[in-house]
């Protein structure tokens, strides 16, 4: 035996120690970042450590305290909102959450001017929502499912909407399928830019049917929660658009904006509101089947005291492929004519990228091009237009933040973020203040994520904002694992993954694989972030490698990988998890024996189907909250990419694509189904279906439910979770405890 | 009840301004728009262009943009006309008109008309 | 613009019968919540008096036997029993788009 001196015996690596379960569970490796709160083109509110709202003005370097903690403290404030004339600020209290975005919680509005509580007309409680007009210190808010108005915080409201119902109609909020698969917000209300319209969405639930589950709490009877929600091929809400004058709110009261004829000639969906001017405003609708878009330029008629959208301002766009756009359709981002856009959709070759609409979208010019996707439009000024795309290296899972100037001719592209800190940052989201004058970076990783604040028209970095240094620190004595992000090619499709590795690997010998899996549709996993998380804890101190694989169906690779799993989910997804498993074993250091699969949501959905595919592969695997059947899932979200659940349209893939017609194929493999009984959005019934059918089949199974928490198995929840998924995992891989 | 009662007629030579006036009674001035509108002698009606007294806002037939400018005085609920670089095709009956509540560009109430005659 | 053509230019027709006239638009002055087409009468000297707005909504104090219809491009307004006031002069106005515009009038005279 020859003895070579090892890094062990280093003393510096004496004191590194493997991340724990306990790490991971206390957050004790989360690391923070810094958004500004914009409040004019150099100044932003950000809320210090000690809890004081505090304005930052870039230009003179000075900063003050707007708001004291003690004022927050008074009212037990968790968050807070200044008025655009700041005169006055709201403390939201009381929080209490809803579904994914939406909550209540108590409004007190704090007037700046004489350091007192706005007295007289207070706010009813609880608020589902409110906010400033863009101008001023006009307050709109929804109580009860009603609108309500109001001139000045101390002023009487007015009463804008008067059919509000629990349940039934909602206004200027979305209702559950609305705010989960179609605005992604807690509201569905939209000031104009100078705050002389409102606009808002009413949704009409009355005919949804209703899910209905048990809620156990702490008496003697548990409650139901009922949800209108509409699962495939059931009712839908019935939304209608309307606009107020909030300047005479009683004169002609509010006027609903037209759907465009193409549109409304069948069932169809609201997509969202972007304001252009006082009064223009773009709406974008959506056929039923979502493979038709409808983008519609309306224009206040000040002799009709309503809404014109002419046939000529109506702006198609069809996927012929696959369904219209990526996760949702894309919004446009109006140039300064108040007309024009730059919007990101499929291009010729079937790539997303940005093009310029100035009258038809035939006519659209393309503004970038290539194989990789432009993902996100943040801001277009008179001479620049800033963009985030995965171009860079031709990295999918990056994000670098380009700059378009438009002012010139033939326009100019510059890479913003490439070079700045190119091993630490490779994944970049931006913020910018008005008219972009300064813009803040935000950098997720591969390294400590980093904040920056930059000039918006040098690109200069001015201060950094945040580095994690304390993480940083932290990170010193843990033995980390390694990362590597890399792709298969298999029969002409390219399949990246990102794969962690135990700190000692060592590529001569064999370890149990993991395989993380999301897989939905527009998803994507392999993404170059920094994060210490669960998977992170399995690497380090239980020595498996876990890896994650976008397949057939996942995002910014182009259509041809996106759309592939058009009316077929539950196929191609779950080949590729396993083509890629077979390609890792070839590689030599993976133990056959000891392969897992593991999935949330629709991953559980994919897990399920993995273990289940009869392969012989996987020893054993989990599925958290995962869906059973497409025929138990939301219309908007389930339809989008399935198409309907009738004979004459998709009924028979419904059918084939559940976990229950594979009951038998789990005979053969360990299994763990886990699902919190309070399910708001994968229902419980998914799990419960599962569960039946493994039964009924008398197949043996392992099962925990978490009763009265929804589909993020939340707070102590979380602990007993992954504690338990480890227990099972290391059984599986005959690893000591 | 509603009533626009407009000024007398009036004689002008080629290349003069006439300002032409109408005042409004029995409804809130402020929230109905006034439309102008002129008839030649033995012709059909010709839309002048609008005026929006509480928000301010005003849109002119392209033909007369830089000729015309429409006013109003909410103090005393009239809305005025002014037509200047007079020409002897502008000699027409001139009216005001209130937009209809309902009638989404329909003129619900009129005045009586003021005769300009342009003459050199 | 939307330019309106009436015809006929001139309808002669005795008290007590029907009078229909027609009003064409160039383009359509419908959306899907109205038809954006409004009616006048205007007697010699007087100013232009509405009957129907919005194509076919009677405007107050108009006797019924006055009545519009259409949508699109084209409309009509109808007279179902002429009484010697309704001799005159009815102009049709559109308001869909700006310029708002008129057309040129058709003359309903006594036989």
């Known amino acids: 035996i020859v003895l070579r001196p090892s890094r062990v015996h280093n003393s510096e690596e004496n004191t590194m120690r493997a991340l724990t379960l306990k790490d991971i569970l206390n957050g004790t490796f989360s690391y923070k970042t810094f958004f500004p709160n914009w409040i004019s083109g150099q100044e932003y509110l950000h809320q210090s450590a000690d809890n004081n709202i505090v304005l930052y003005n870039i230009e003179t370097g000075q900063s003050y305290t707007i708001l004291s903690n003690r004022t927050m403290k008074s009212v037990n404030a968790s968050n807070y909102g200044l008025s655009p004339d700041r005169q006055f600020v709201y403390l939201e209290s009381d929080y209490s959450k809803l579904w994914r975005y939406s909550y209540t919680a108590t409004y007190y509005i704090y007037d700046l001017s004489n350091g007192e509580f706005v007295r007289g007309n207070e706010l009813p409680r609880p608020i589902q929502y409110l906010c400033w007009s863009p101008v001023g210190s006009k307050l709109a808010y929804v109580y009860q499912n009603n609108i309500y108005l109001k001139q000045r915080p101390g002023d009487p409201p007015f009463q804008i909407t008067f059919n509000g119902r629990e349940n039934k109609i909602f206004n200027g909020i979305p209702d559950w399928v609305y705010e989960e698969e179609m605005l992604a917000t807690k509201y569905a209300l939209w000031w104009s830019p100078n705050g002389k319209f409102l606009a808002y969405a009413e949704f009409n639930d009355t005919d949804i049917p209703v899910i209905a589950y048990s809620y156990y709490g702490d008496e003697q009877y548990p409650r139901t929660i009922n949800i209108p929600y509409p699962k495939a091929g059931a009712k839908n809400p019935v939304v209608r658009i309307f606009i107020i004058d909030t300047t005479y709110p009683a004169y002609v009261g509010p006027q609903e904006v037209p759907v465009p004829a193409m549109i409304a000639s069948s069932d169809y969906y609201f997509s969202w509101l972007t304001w252009v001017t006082d009064e223009r405003v773009c709406l974008q609708w959506l056929k039923r089947v979502q493979n038709v878009s409808v983008l519609s330029i309306c224009d206040f008629r000040e002799d009709w005291q309503t809404w014109d959208c002419p046939k000529t301002q109506e702006h198609i766009e069809e996927s012929r492929t696959g369904w219209a756009g990526g996760f949702f359709v894309s919004t446009p981002v109006f140039s300064y004519d108040a007309i024009s856009y730059y919007k990101i959709f499929s291009d010729k070759d079937g790539y997303k990228h940005i093009h310029y609409i100035k009258d038809t979208v035939e006519n659209a010019i393309q503004i970038t091009s290539g194989k990789w996707e432009a993902i996100n439009i943040f801001r277009v000024t008179q001479d620049s237009l800033f963009y985030s795309s995965n171009e860079f290296e031709e990295y999918p899972g990056r994000r670098n933040i380009y700059r378009i100037s438009i002012g010139s001719y033939p326009p100019s592209k510059k890479c913003v973020t490439c070079h700045l800190r190119k091993e630490r940052c490779q994944y970049y989201t931006a913020s910018f203040s008005d008219y972009a004058k300064y813009y803040a970076l935000v950098c997720y990783g591969p390294g400590i994520p980093i904040s920056t604040l930059h000039d918006g028209r040098t690109d200069q970095e001015i201060k950094i904002l945040e580095e994690n240094k304390e993480l940083e620190n932290a990170l010193k004595n843990i033995q980390l694992p390694k990362e590597e992000i890399k792709k298969l090619e298999v029969d002409e499709i390219t399949l990246w993954y990102k794969m962690i590795l135990p700190p000692q690997f060592d590529r001569s010998k064999k370890y149990p694989l993991l395989i993380q899996v999301y897989g939905g549709p527009c998803s994507q996993s392999v993404r170059s972030v920094f994060a210490v998380n669960w998977i992170s804890y399995l690497a380090s101190k239980e020595g498996m490698v876990i890896a994650l694989v976008d397949g057939r169906g996942t995002a910014f690779q182009g259509d041809k990988l996106l759309y592939a799993v058009y009316r077929k989910l539950g196929v191609y997804e779950v080949e590729d998890q396993i083509t890629a498993v077979r390609k890792f074993i070839e590689m030599g250091f993976i133990d056959e024996k000891r392969i897992a699969i593991w999935g949330w949501s629709y991953g559980g959905y994919v897990s399920s189907l993995a273990l289940a595919s009869g392969t012989g592969l996987f020893k054993c695997g989990i599925a958290v909250a995962p869906v059973s059947s497409w025929e138990y899932y939301a219309s908007v979200y389930t339809e989008r990419f399935m198409g309907l659940p009738t004979k004459d349209d998709n009924l028979e893939h419904y059918k084939n694509s559940t976990v229950m017609a594979r009951a038998e194929y789990f005979r053969n493999v360990d299994y763990l189904l886990i699902h919190g009984t309070a399910d708001d959005n994968v229902h419980f019934q998914n799990s419960a279906q599962i569960a039946k059918a493994l039964v009924n089949a008398q197949v043996d199974f392992q099962a925990m439910w978490y009763s009265d928490q929804n589909h993020g198995l939340s707070g102590l929840s979380t602990n007993h979770l992954y504690t338990h998924m480890t227990h099972f995992l290391k059984q599986c891989f005959s690893l000591s405890d | 009840q509603v009533q626009l009662v407009q000024s007398g007629a009036e004689v002008k030579k080629p290349g003069a301004s006439v300002k032409v006036s109408c005042k409004a009674s029995g409804y809130t001035f402020t929230e109905a728009i006034i439309h102008w509108v002129r008839q030649a002698p033995g012709q059909g009606l010709e839309w002048m262009g609008w005026?929006?007294?509480?928000?301010?806002?005003?849109k002119y037939a392209q033909k007369l943009q830089g000729r015309v400018t429409m006013t109003t005085d909410t103090s005393t609920s009239t809305a005025y006309m002014e037509l200047r670089s007079l020409r002897s095709d502008d000699t027409a009956v001139y009216y005001c008109?209130?937009?209809?509540?309902?009638?989404?560009?329909?003129?619900?109430?009129w005045g009586q008309g003021t005769l300009v005659t342009v003459s050199s | 613009e939307i330019v309106l053509t009436q015809s006929p230019g001139t309808l002669s027709l005795s008290p007590g019968e029907r009078a229909t006239l027609s009003c064409r638009a160039s383009q359509s002055v419908s959306t899907s919540a109205y038809s954006y087409m409004h009616w006048y009468q205007q007697k010699p000297g007087q100013a232009p008096r509405l009957l129907i707005y919005?194509?076919?909504n009677l405007e107050s104090g108009i006797p019924d036997r006055f009545s519009g219809s259409g949508s699109g491009t084209d409309f009509t307004l109808t007279i179902s029993r002429l009484e010697p006031e309704d001799f005159a002069v009815y102009y049709c106005?559109?308001?869909?788009?700006?310029?708002?515009?008129f057309g040129q009038g058709t003359k309903l005279e006594i036989k």
């Open positions: 005026i929006h007294p509480g928000s301010g806002s005003i």
């Open positions: 008109a209130r937009h209809g509540g309902t009638g989404r560009g329909a003129m619900d109430y």
């Open positions: 106005q559109q308001s869909r788009e700006l310029p708002y515009t």
């Open positions: 919005l194509a076919s």
